[in-house]
Amino acid sequence: IPTEIPASALVKETLALLSTHRTLLIANETLRIPVPVHKNHQLCTEEIFQGIGTLESQTVQGGTVERLFKNLSLIKKYIGGQKKKCGEERRRVNQFLDYLQEFLGVMNTEWIIESH
Amino acid sequence: IPTEIPASALVKETLALLSTHRTLLIANETLRIPVPVHKNHQLCTEEIFQGIGTLESQTVQGGTVERLFKNLSLIKKYIGGQKKKCGEERRRVNQFLDYLQEFLGVMNTEWIIESH
């Protein structure tokens, strides 16, 4: 993410552009894109960005819609950077267990887990 | 995940076992495992389960610690199932845009984005 625009501001601007250009983006009535069927979004980043790629290739570029896809490309880069940070630091088992506990805690409280 | 234990109950039980067996799990003082340095846990599921594998191979099995690793294996399976559901359904662009908007909205409100 370039230092001149923080990730949080980038996300906000992208949300606004997405809303503005919705009718332009849905112009292709026949296009079908894979949509995840659960709300644990972070698990699906690859599929989301593949979908964005499909959409971009089908959308007439120009003006601020170009800005939208540029932003989405920067967000993809940011997430790629975050994914890199998943395995960069080798630490004691204590600290790994802390992370695992946090992960399970988040699963326990924030994940949408369908009942079986 | 077997139908006899819902995922949410499994996660709760695993958290309790993790706490109980902490000293057993950190018995190898020299072992180092990659620990993600941000809190967007779902981005790091692969690395987390690789770490669990490393830990399991270094831990003396038996008793309820075996139950802990069995549970973690079931959670991994559950997450694998969720990842599969990321690309199963092909939908209209409107629905993809709805999902993208939710994803960015979650990024905007819930992700831990470091300031640059």
Epitope: Q101 | R22, T23, L24, I26, A27, N28
Partner: antibody, heavy 119, light 106 residues
């Protein structure tokens, strides 16, 4: 209520050794690490190291590696620290403290052992 | 070793808000804990992992920060809060403590 009861004050000569104890009660001793911390007169705190009562494994601050030896007796739920080749700089209060588990904060502390090195 | 720098002393009146800072010489993610020590007593855990309130500690105490800059806040300060406050990190070996901040009440 978790308690860590430490042994009494010690007056020792330079070059001698001292072994202090820390008796834990009201929790499962083998489920939490025990740390040792030094506090010199009017000074800050220094982490000496910890022992895992489950395995007997230890992690030391490099600075204290040749000075301190940490051990445990699981049956009496007691942790020990032996400090050897004492010098005047070793005069301090020594605390044992329980590790709280998640993120390893020191959640319960003993009352401290005052060690005075004097010839 | 990771050096933790705290200002040596602060003086506040009861009822005021006070912030005690701790700056680390290198990044610690959120592995910072805070302790209170009164004269003649052992330290007492207040905050663990930067922002989590330890069991039995009044909600007047709070912690914030990540990376290299951390803060312990007491709001409002009470007469009983006169003590020395230590920060401690355990992200890097060896674990280290700050020099302590002595909080005096006016």
């Amino acid at each position: 209520q978790v308690k860590l009861l430490q042994s009494g004050a010690a007056l020792v000569k330079p070059g001698d050794s001292v072994k202090m104890s820390c008796k834990a009660s009201d929790y499962t001793f083998t489920e939490y690490l025990i740390h040792w911390v030094k506090q010199s007169q009017g000074r800050s705190l220094e982490w000496i190291g910890y022992i895992n009562p489950y395995s007997g494994g230890t992690v030391y601050n490099e600075k204290f590696k040749s000075k301190a030896t940490l051990t445990v007796d699981k049956f009496s739920s007691t942790a020990y620290m032996e400090f050897r080749r004492l010098t005047f700089e070793d005069s301090a209060i020594y605390y044992c403290a329980r590790d709280g588990g998640y993120s390893d904060p020191l959640d319960y502390w003993g009352q401290g052992v005052m060690v005075t090195v004097s010839s | 070793d990771t050096v933790l720098t705290q200002s040596p002393a602060l003086a506040v009146s009861p009822g005021e808000r006070v912030s005690i800072s701790c700056r680390a010489s290198e990044g610690l993610t959120s592995y910072m804990h805070w302790y209170q020590q009164k004269p003649g007593q052992q330290p007492k855990l207040l905050i663990y992992k930067a922002s989590n309130l330890a069991s039995g500690v009044p909600a007047r105490f709070s912690g914030s920060g990540s990376g290299t800059d951390f803060t312990l806040t007491i709001d409002p300060v009470e007469a009983d809060d006169a003590a020395t406050y230590f920060c401690q990190q355990n992200w890097n070996d060896p674990w280290t403590f700050g020099g302590g901040t002595k909080l005096e009440l006016k």
